[in-house]
């Protein structure tokens, strides 16, 4: 006991790498190795005591000349052999550290997904805000400037840009007006903005019979039904999204009118499909 090998012959096979090493030497717990650490460190004397396990009380490793220290320059030549069941191979907190790391990773991923996951941009057409009417008697033409109100809600945890709003108005399945607004606004996280837009419309030509209706003296309210169509284009993270809505709205073509928001939706009116 107490002998140490200064050199081990190199073998190509792991299975017989320790041929010639006596069981006594194996019990000593140290084996000479020609294999160097990957990082090639050759620092000061190691501070870890090497101990021989004999089944009885452990004694200081004689290979270290009883100092419990590895002489400088031998750290990369000596290999410790210890039982697999040794607790030092299984520090108690390893599982805890691993689980904590996994938990933190999952938590961070979850938070990233939660905050960055694209949520809906809600567009709600509120209704007609105002309608200003004028006539061309000679051409039997009606001009209606219709101002509409939209509520746009950003349900995301980041800002979105309302790139453009395109709107058109139909009467009797015929497009009578179009409008487009560009670079409108930026809506902050979890914020809502109300946007007004005006569509100039013209009721004329094959619908010029409407001039008679809209100017009829015997009628108090000259309500007509118009189909309002609106498309909102929003962008975030370079991604573009379009939300469209269409709604029948009631407009008085006989006089200038300002509506309570949503009021024009419930008036008793019609839309012929000529």
């Amino acid at each position: 006991m107490g002998k140490s090998l200064s050199h081990l012959p190199l073998h190509s096979s792991k299975e017989d790498a320790y041929d010639g090493v006596t069981s006594e030497n194996m019990r000593n717990g140290l084996v000479n190795s020609e294999v160097h650490n990957e990082d090639g460190r050759n620092g000061d004397v190691s501070q870890f005591p090497y101990v021989e396990f004999t089944g009885r009380d452990s004694v200081t490793c004689p290979t270290c000349q009883g100092t419990g220290r590895i002489p400088r320059g031998q750290e990369n030549q000596l290999v410790a052999l210890i039982p697999y069941s040794d607790q030092r191979l299984r520090p108690r907190r390893t599982k805890l550290y691993v689980m904590a790391s996994v938990f933190v990773c999952l938590l961070l991923s979850g938070l990233a997904v939660f905050f960055l996951f694209p949520r809906s941009i809600d567009v709600k057409y509120i209704g007609v805000k105002s309608a200003y009417v004028s006539y061309d008697v000679q051409k039997r033409t009606i001009y209606l400037n219709i101002t509409n109100t939209l509520n746009i809600t950003n349900n995301n945890y980041y800002s979105v840009e309302v790139e453009n709003i395109t709107a058109q108005v139909q009467f009797s399945k015929t497009v009578i007006g179009k409008a487009r607004l560009n670079n409108i606004t930026i809506i902050g996280p979890l914020d809502m903005k109300q946007i007004d837009y005006t569509v100039p419309t013209v009721i004329a030509e094959e619908m010029s019979y409407m001039y008679d209706f809209c100017t009829l003296i015997s009628i108090k309210v000259h309500n007509i039904v118009l189909m309002m169509q609106v498309t909102v284009t929003t962008t975030y993270f370079g991604h573009s999204e379009q939300i469209s809505q269409e709604r029948y709205q009631y407009v008085d073509c006989g006089r200038n009118t300002t509506y309570q928001l949503g009021q024009s939706e419930y008036l008793n009116v019609l839309q012929p499909q000529q």
């Epitope: 039997r140 030509e205 094959e206 010029s208 019979y209 409407m210 008679d212 209706f213 309500n223 007509i224 039904v225 029948y248 008793n268 009116v269 019609l270 839309q271 012929p272 499909q273 000529q274």
Partner: antibody
Framework: QVQLQQSGAELVKPGASVKMSCKAS????????IEWMKQSHGKGLEWIGN????????KYNEKFKGKATLTVDKSSSTVYLDLSRLTSDDSAVYYC??????????WGQGTSVTVSS | DIQMTQSPASLSVSVGETVTITCRAS??????LGWYQQKQGESPQLLVF???NLADGVPSRFSGSGSGTQYSLKINSLQSEDFGTYYC?????????FGGGTRLEIK
């Protein structure tokens, strides 16, 4: 005042065709669409189709496609209804009327068509 | 096609009474509805257009009401000249269709 004058009664044989007219006066002819209706004896009213003199736009009830044809003579402000391949089911009074927003405000006196051999 | 269901089919009333005729559309027609009166051997005559507006020359005892799918024509204090057949008609989407008619006769 607005008037729609329809042509007189017709007695025709089965398989033949008939063309009736509706002459408009008292307003700008190209402004209002002209509607055509059928009323069988003692029965309700059925819409056949309409014609808009402004742009010659014609619309038909699916039931009368292939049976009815609407044409116009703008110089005389007259719209024509042509009925082909007549059968006894086509015996009825045919009305023309002027379209207005939410109703037909002026009606012709009607043209009676009798299909008999 | 939009179906128009008119009721009642016939009505026997006395002069001076008030009557209400109803018309139900199979879908929303947004008040695009006309009421007509037709007397024997005559052409129909427009009474009410756009559900609530009285046509020129129609007596004020006639009135139209309703919205969506339910509409009615009310005649207050019936006169002898009011007897005949009444039709409703929608003008919302082609084809326009008429109700089956309500025959109003003297009791």
């Amino acid at each position: 005042q607005v008037q729609l004058q329809q042509s007189g009664a017709e007695l025709v044989k089965p398989g033949a065709s008939v063309k009736m007219s509706c002459k408009a006066s008292g307003y700008t002819f190209t402004t209002f669409p002209i509607e055509w209706m059928k009323q069988s004896h003692g029965k309700g009213l059925e819409w056949i189709g309409n014609f808009h003199p402004y742009n010659d736009d014609t619309k038909y009830n699916e039931k009368f496609k292939g049976k009815a044809t609407l044409t116009v003579d703008k110089s005389s402000s007259t719209v024509y209804l042509d009925l082909s391949r007549l059968t006894s089911d086509d015996s009825a009074v045919y009305y023309c009327a002027r379209y207005f927003y939410g109703g037909m405000d002026y009606w012709g006196q009607g043209t009676s068509v009798t299909v008999s051999s | 096609d939009i179906q128009m269901t008119q009721s009642p089919a016939s009505l026997s009333v006395s002069v001076g009474e008030t009557v209400t005729i109803t018309c139900r559309a199979s879908e929303n027609i947004y008040s695009s509805l006309g009421w007509y009166q037709q007397k024997q051997g005559e052409s129909p005559q427009l009474l009410v257009f756009a559900a609530t507006n009285l046509a020129d020359g129609v007596p004020s005892r006639f009135s139209g009401s309703g919205s969506g799918t339910q509409y009615s024509l009310k005649i207050n204090s019936l006169q002898s000249e009011d007897f005949g057949t009444y039709y409703c008609q929608h003008l919302w989407s082609i084809p326009w269709t008429f109700g089956g008619g309500t025959r109003l006769e003297i009791k």
